[in-house]
Amino acid sequence: KLTIESTPFNVAEGKEVLLLVHNLPQHLFGYSWYKGERVDGNRQIIGYVIGTQQATPGPAYSGREIIYPNASLLIQNIIQNDTGFYTLHVIKSDLVNEEATGQFRVYPELPKPSISSNNSKPVEDKDAVAFTCEPETQDATYLWWVNNQSLPVSPRLQLSNGNRTLTLFNVTRNDTASYKCETQNPVSARRSDSVILNVLYGPDAPTISPLNTSYRSGENLNLSCHAASNPPAQYSWFVNGTFQQSTQELFIPNITVNNSGSYTCQAHNSDTGLNRTTVTTITVYAEPPKPFITSNNSNPVEDEDAVALTCEPEIQNTTYLWWVNNQSLPVSPRLQLSNDNRTLTLLSVTRNDVGPYECGIQNELSVDHSDPVILNVLYGPDDPTISPSYTYYRPGVNLSLSCHAASNPPAQYSWLIDGNIQQHTQELFISNITEKNSGLYTCQANNSASGHSRTTVKTITVSAELPKPSISSNNSKPVEDKDAVAFTCEPEAQNTTYLWWVNGQSLPVSPRLQLSNGNRTLTLFNVTRNDARAYVCGIQNSVSANRSDPVTLDVLYGPDTPIISPPDSSYLSGANLNLSCHSASNPSPQYSWRINGIPQQHTQVLFIAKITPNNNGTYACFVSNLATGRNNSIVKSITVSA
């Protein structure tokens, strides 16, 4: 179908627009463009006759239009009045007419906006500020950005005047940010320069850092004071009430017990004239040595070796602590601590036991940590994985197999084809394969440290003909209204389409049927007895197709409510009573009878010869399906008249 695409749809004044023609028929006599939604000679822009390659301007031609041999129309130096619909009228060589209409809209380019403010230095919790985006522009959308993010939701923020004005009520220090406004229309978006709101506040109560108040003799004491304040606060330090210095930081090297005492920081805001102080008490203690870890085995082998880690030095009356992966020790039968907690033994190490391990010595003041120790656990190789998982390839493609086995140190890899060694690399690449490349591809992974090797074998088939597929199922005996079944079409093959049939028909549309994995997998949710059908999968590519043998789904169901026959409930004395019970079930249910609540026999048929009025009562048939675990029953009243 002939269509017109406007590129772009929204056009900026002064720019150009291309009315691009799609699906132009062949064998044309000519074509003509019109302003508007129909062929109207008074509004013809330009006509073009193929044979003469001659363009003829029409009444609506402005001199800004160029028609191309492919019928596309370029309009240059766009003006507002150009907005609207344009119709292309195409005349084919058999004088059959076709027409198509396109449209575009024209918008002005926006100028760069700016922000005006009614208050340059507002005071926290007191003043309001109104920002206005200039200039006022018609058909423009106004947006605001705070620190290059869109406006947060806040009852203190209010947009007005068509979003041109942003008002911040009761400013806080958190409003000290970069504010930008943006004007947008469909052809342009312009952002203003940033305006930084300067809110005056503080000082708040100063914070002295670090927070710890206990130090060891010989350390450096480096205290820093900070109070939130605008303009920034001026700081003074006092020790035990005596002025020390007017700095933000107080530094005392190589402290002793004599440096214990009260440390006061005073913050002063010169603009507000306010002062705030904070006091911290510092205690200085004598220093213990830094601990370290020794190990009895630096390269343990997974599942074979044990490792004993010992925290040095040995100090009397000291508490030893351990951390693994920066966490306290997990509870595990493979982790054992000595009586004094100084030695940590890992029994039968695994690859997950690498650490890091740290020990610590605790005193009144703090815990001294050792440097971390990492175990180099030798493991693997595990069974290698060959990827990709395809087993079937077409001739002419490239075969690229990659092998990976978890191993420390990293495994060395070898490739064998049909038992013949090929190369010692992790990847095997064979270009432009043929049927001769079919065979058994073995990846061997070797760990030089442990001397262990593991192999994985993959059968690769190279054939133009697809193999006969087969269906694998994750549930051979699903239970009705309970289980789901996933059928998978094997093998997985490159560039192959997978198809499914049920009872020889294509898949019905059902919310319980779902295709996934590139249509390789068919999942039946909440199976019902009606799903017990023959399922066939098919694979096809550009040269061949094949179907699997059918797989019949065996759905376990029931037992349904049983039916007792015959339906008669009145009998004459002396007659034979022959009741048969039936319940739909897979597998067939087990039957049992009760007369007036008393168990009788485990048969489907209940027979009583020559009944009398003594045989009056309730006859119950019980059915149970051992496979589904479900039971059912029905009760029938029998009356025997003399």
């Epitope: 064998h27 006599f29 062929v39 006509g47 044979g51 003469t52 001659q54 084919k92 060589s93 007419n97």
Partner: antibody, heavy 117, light 107 residues
Framework: QVQLVQSGAEVKKPGSSVKVSCKAS????????ISWVRRAPGQGLEWMGH????????GYAQKFQGRVTITADESTSTAYMELSSLRSEDTAVYYC??????????WGQGTLVTVSS | DIQMTQSPSSLSASVGDRVTITCRAS??????LNWYQEKPGKAPKLLIY???SLQSGVPSRFSGSGSGTDFTLTISSLQPEDFATYYC?????????FGQGTKLEIK
């Protein structure tokens, strides 16, 4: 101004053929299509077919298919309409006309063809 | 083929009258419709093209309207030279078809 000048009147016997010419002047011959239309006595206008001179593409009304042949000679800016197996009901004024972007705009003066035994 | 039906087939009117001729297509032809005037012994003359566009040199008392299947030719004030036969013609399909004509006579 485009002018289409047709050949003179013809008298023909039933079963014979007639060939009417139409010469274009005052414009580019191949920037349009040439249509042929006839009007039989007491009847309305009836379109017969057309040709695009530049590429020789021709189309015919079903009624005349097989009996009419429309050709064009670019070198002389002349179009021709030949109607064969003439019968008395083919007696009519035959017009050539130019088709451009808006259907037929300019007409020839007409050629009377009389079919009589 | 697309059939074109004109009505009325003939019409008597006086100089100065306003006259309307209608043309109906058997299927939608968008605005691909022309109106022609034919006088005895003369070739037809194009009056209106594309349903509503006035051909250059044609008096403005002639006007056309319509789209789809129903079209109208209007002469706002009849002049003596306007008495003639008027044809509509569709060019939506390359099998051009004409209406049967409307003969406009002096009352």
């Amino acid at each position: 101004q485009v002018q289409l000048v047709q050949s003179g009147a013809e008298v023909k016997k039933p079963g014979s053929s007639v060939k009417v010419s139409c010469k274009a002047s005052g414009g580019t011959f191949h920037d349009g299509a040439i249509s042929w239309v006839r009007r039989a006595p007491g009847q309305g206008l009836e379109w017969m077919g057309h040709i695009i001179p530049i590429d020789g593409t021709a189309g015919y009304a079903q009624k005349f298919q097989g009996r009419v042949t429309i050709t064009a000679d670019e070198s002389t800016s002349t179009a021709y309409m030949e109607l064969s197996s003439l019968r008395s009901e083919d007696t009519a004024v035959y017009y050539c006309a130019r088709y451009r972007f808006y259907g037929i705009d300019y007409w020839g003066q007409g050629t009377l063809v009389t079919v009589s035994s | 083929d697309i059939q074109m039906t004109q009505s009325p087939s003939s019409l008597s009117a006086s100089v100065g009258d306003r006259v309307t001729i209608t043309c109906r297509a058997s299927q939608s032809i968008s605005s691909y419709l022309n109106w022609y005037q034919e006088k005895p012994g003369k070739a037809p003359k194009l009056l209106i093209y594309a349903a509503s566009s006035l051909q250059s040199g044609v008096p403005s008392r002639f006007s056309g309207s319509g789209s789809g299947t129903d079209f109208t030719l209007t002469i706002s004030s009849l002049q003596p030279e306007d008495f003639a036969t008027y044809y509509c013609q569709q060019w939506r399909s390359h099998l051009f078809t004409f209406g049967q004509g409307t003969k406009l006579e002096i009352k």
